[in-house]
């Protein structure tokens, strides 16, 4: 409950806000959930708390975990959880689903792409923008405050857009990148019965106990903008939100990508610190549109280590 997923890349800055709303004057205490150890407020620490914000300057893969924030107002104490995952930098250009923020869609008239989470950082313009890892150049692209505007949007403008900026903390600079998909609304579209691309039905995924794992549910629904197209994960036939286990979270927002002109939607189930009991659960990837519902099931199994003599 009151848990928010946050993610970032190693050696970049990551700033996370406590998911409980309140006034900036409220005292907020931050703890490592597993150890209940208080997080320092002194800025000389690489990880420190600053009111409603938890700052990783810079982040390391080992910072991944669940953090507890307690917001203390004069009348109430409210608890929230920040589920943080820090990933290794990708060697190639490909940005995996689990690093993507929610998809935005645009049309000829409206083509603003906001840089996700930027409001949490102390940054100065201009932002750098990349599409599919290539720096954007040309008069069609205008970096304006915290968003990118594309003039005369065309279907080939669809793709993954990354914003890059510098966070400044006490004179020290830290790089931050964030990526989201941009889709272009196509008037000539159609919809199909959902086709689940991943996982395969009755698939089994090998996992290590104690490690983190991600399951991607990906389905295609037709061509062009879809009126209703949603994918979600269920655990033993129950909604994730009804399953009160903060280690298991479905990402906020769904990423839309176009594969061979098809409208496809992905959502990632993030499982932190895999436990034995997670292997007993049935994980259902559900894809739903106006044509109906399709379900693929995946289970987790313990990774077998092969010993070579």
């Amino acid at each position: 409950k009151f848990s928010k997923q946050s993610w970032g890349l190693e050696n970049e800055a990551l700033i996370v806000r406590c998911p409980r709303q309140g006034k900036s004057s409220y005292i907020v205490d931050w703890y490592y959930s597993q150890t209940n150890k208080s997080i320092p407020t002194q800025e000389r620490n690489r990880v420190f708390a600053s009111g409603q914000l938890l700052k990783f300057l810079p982040a390391e893969v080992a910072d991944s975990g669940i953090y507890t924030c307690i917001v203390r107002s004069p009348t109430f104490n409210r608890t929230g959880y920040a589920n943080v995952t820090i990933y290794k930098k990708q060697p190639d250009c490909n940005v995996p689903d689990y690093l993507m923020y929610s998809t935005v869609s645009g049309s000829e008239k409206n083509s603003k792409i906001y840089c996700p989470t930027i409001d949490l950082y102390n940054w100065t313009a201009p932002l750098e923008w990349f599409k599919n890892c290539q720096a954007l150049q040309g008069s069609r692209y205008k970096a304006h405050k915290s968003f990118l505007v594309i003039d005369n949007v065309m279907t080939d403008d669809a793709g993954d857009y990354t914003c890059k900026f510098i966070h400044n903390e006490n004179g020290a600079n830290y790089s931050v990148t964030a990526t989201r998909s941009f889709t272009v609304k196509d008037e000539q579209g159609f919809s199909l019965f959902p086709v689940i691309r991943a996982p395969a039905h009755n698939e089994t995924k090998e996992v290590e106990i104690g490690e983190n794992t991600n399951l991607t549910c990906s389905a295609c629904f037709g061509k062009g903008a879809q009126f209703l197209a949603t994918v979600q994960w269920q655990l033993n036939g129950n909604k994730i939100t009804d399953f009160s286990e903060p280690r298991i979270q479905q990402e906020e927002g769904q990423n839309q990508s176009f594969s061979n002109g098809l409208a496809c939607v992905n959502t990632v189930l993030r499982i932190a610190d895999v436990k034995e009991e997670d292997l007993l659960l049935r994980y259902d990837c559900l894809a739903l549109n106006l044509h109906g519902l399709r379900r693929h099931t995946i289970r987790l199994s313990r990774k077998h280590h092969h010993h070579h003599h």
Partner: antibody
Amino acid sequence: EVQLVQSGAEVKKPGATVKISCKVSAFNIKDDYMHWVQQAPGKGLEWMGRIDPAIGNTEYAEKFQGRVTITADTSTDTAYMELSSLRSEDTAVYYCATGDFYAMAYWGQGTLVTVSS
Amino acid sequence: DIQMTQSPSSLSASVGDRVTITCITNTDIDDVIHWYQQKPGKAPKLLIYEGNTLRPGVPSRFSGSGSGTDFTLTISSLQPEDFATYYCLQSDNMLTFGQGTKLEIK
């Protein structure tokens, strides 16, 4: 002990405006949120809106949007609720209550507003 | 808008009885449900916040439970001073009170 003392009962004509005050003691009004709640005779509680007195940010329930204005004077630790274009169904007891973003902890004694021609 | 359905609207019970009042929301809310007691001519009083946290000074016979869309206030053994009207309040999205449950002496 935290106390919220509201202004006295009011009788208003339809179409008029009423402004109720709520003075907070043993508590700094800037430190929390101030909520206002309506209760018509024999009826349930209806949340009207809230203010963060430190910065003046307000949020109103859809039902009262456009007719209610909540303000706060941090120098006197007093909050105000103004309701305009009064009609007979606005006859009610109005409560101020302090709390955080999510709920109310301490309540005023209530102010009865009667709207009658 | 989040709708709250509180039931029953009225309830007759005797001293010593165990009583439960239910609130159902039309959408999943993050345990941001609170329970208030109101006596005639008085301001409401907060009993339980965040689903199940007892407010300091509130007797332990009051308890809250539930999650998602279904929430319950339980009074384990009714005392004479408990006869009043009870309201649930959701604050997941703005704030909405339930319709109230009037608890009367049988």
